[in-house]
Amino acid sequence: SIPWNLERITPPRYRADEYQPPDGGSLVEVYLLDTSIQSDHREIEGRVMVTDFENVPEEDGTRFHRQASKCDSHGTHLAGVVSGRDAGVAKGASMRSLRVLNCQGKGTVSGTLIGLEFIRKSQLVQPVGPLVVLLPLAGGYSRVLNAACQRLARAGVVLVTAAGNFRDDACLYSPASAPEVITVGATNAQDQPVTLGTLGTNFGRCVDLFAPGEDIIGASSDCSTCFVSQSGTSQAAAHVAGIAAMMLSAEPELTLAELRQRLIHFSAKDVINEAWFPEDQRVLTPNLVAALPPSTHENLYFQ
Amino acid sequence: GAMGQEDEDGDYEELVLALRSEEDGLAEAPEHGTTATFHRCAKDPWRLPGTYVVVLKEETHLSQSERTARRLQAQAARRGYLTKILHVFHGLLPGFLVKMSGDLLELALKLPHVDYIEEDSSVFAQ
């Protein structure tokens, strides 16, 4: 049966026993800046082109053992959430991966900047259709990272990022705090904000909307046919990147402002239990859970 | 995210180092009164001191970025400091990434075309 997260973003008309927009997002390229990925996993084979871009810091610790499946875990799962054959949102989207996070899931602002510059140069050398850039990472507030995101957004690229898993104001993190970026918080099957250990999803006025981000089934790098459940605002951002890819595939001329407006318009409203957020943040945090457009767009979204 | 907000730095640390006029006899001294700023991550464990993104003013060309980077290296060498230019940015933001001692920040902030300098910091999978 359909995983809860795909059911949650699917308009009621399509809630049959399976989620089947078979070619959603086929005109769009989604760039993923993350860990290395297992690109020939059965769920994503042929859908992800691994670029030669790599800019990562060395792993911490003298006894760190680099195990391929662990190195690939985060990125493989997210690629699966965006475009996986069986558990992906935009099953028709093609992806390109850039490695900016090491085997411990750590990267640098500078490496991310160079990755964003690589995307811009690729766009200039070979202009394609609409581009979505997924940044499932967060660091402290960074003027330069936000500025780079702003420039890329002004070049017509849609950037989607994780709000952060720090149970804190997203405005204190980057790229979550960049105004031009679509910043995504995480909710669970009960439409509650996601708790992650002692922390949880970020919140506040720098968040644009929420999306499923707990117990999300996706490709596991443990084996070529394995699936695993992961949680976090990265998973939530991957859902929105997939939805954005489908919207842009249906309407390639959408501007960032129009896309953002559509994402908000089609979201489920006032379903999140706001009591989880600090009192002073409740009014500032959008009570929106991302969803695909309804059946009026059948011919566009479910090709 | 969330368009329409004012740009707010929150806890972000901004160290403004005023430029002094006795620049090293540069042909292209900065315009009088402009102030380049230094930024670093407010979360101490995430800081990566020793690597800095030098961001130049918006219309700076690649050749000027390269020249500014070389100038920094030359001036640092005169003071007995080794520096390494790790990357020259162009396409999105003009500037360069440099590995150097924090002692050179004041010098770097006085270079022509410099808008601000940010210390590198960590980002994490979410």
């Epitope: 399976e18 078979p22 084979e45 042929g46 992800v48 391929a68 099953k91 084996c223 046919t225 | -």
Partner: antibody
């Protein structure tokens, strides 16, 4: 263009081993693994297993586990399938195909096991 | 894994439509969006005609279409032509492997 080119026909005695090669070209190799499929004379298709061109990981069908070994040589973009302890019912055409999706196939390699 | 169940043979006249079924279980056909259909001429390798239930690779005639309901997938060939006479195989993912149907011989009368 995208191509999978296999090695030539083999005749083997029962108990022997055979190693079939498959050279891939025309696509980003790490984006797909290679599946091996065999077809006995007049019979249907049987999936034997898969190997990753990315990291060399394998996934063998239960039926051939223990008698098959798949390997990859990334320097030459070539994948190998070795079948040991051959029996007469291993007589078949052996195909390599791109990925689990098997959207591109090699021309096939006939392996005859006969005493 | 036992093979997916296909009819051993089907036939049709030129211009007609035929449908070949492929029945599995909830662990293969019913559980995944990844049913493929292959055409094979004697002495030749199989050729992909439909992937992921209903998608056609570029270059494949739109006379070929695929669908799925529950644990059964179907291949329909409309406007039957002499060159469609061949063997047709379905395949599906299982949790850890791949499984093929036994094959259907299509005869164009």
């Amino acid at each position: 263009q995208i191509q999978l080119v296999q090695s030539g026909a083999e005749v083997k005695k029962p108990g022997a081993s055979v190693k079939v090669s498959c050279k891939a070209s025309g696509y980003p190799l790490t984006s797909y693994g290679i599946s091996w499929v065999r077809q006995a004379p007049g019979q249907g298709l049987e999936w034997m297993g898969w190997i990753s061109a990315y990291n060399g990981n394998t996934n063998y069908a239960q039926k051939v586990q223990g008698s098959v070994t798949m390997t990859t040589d990334t320097s030459t973009s070539t994948v190998y399938m070795e079948l040991r302890s051959l029996r007469s019912d291993d007589t078949a055409v052996y195909y390599c195909a791109r990925g689990y999706g098997m959207d591109v196939w090699g021309q096939g390699t006939t392996v005859t096991v006969s005493s | 894994q036992s093979a997916l169940t296909q009819p051993a043979s089907v036939s049709g006249s030129p211009g007609q439509s035929i449908t070949i079924s492929c029945t599995g279980t909830s662990s293969d056909v019913g559980g995944y969006n990844s049913v493929s259909w292959y055409q094979q001429y004697p002495g030749k390798p199989p050729k992909l005609k439909i992937y992921e239930v209903s998608n056609r690779p570029s270059g494949v005639s739109n006379r070929f279409s695929g669908s799925k309901s529950g644990n059964t997938a179907s291949l329909t060939i409309s406007g039957l032509q002499a060159e469609d006479e061949a063997d047709y195989f379905c395949s599906s993912y299982t949790s850890t492997s791949m499984v093929f149907g036994g094959g259907t011989k299509l005869t164009v009368l």
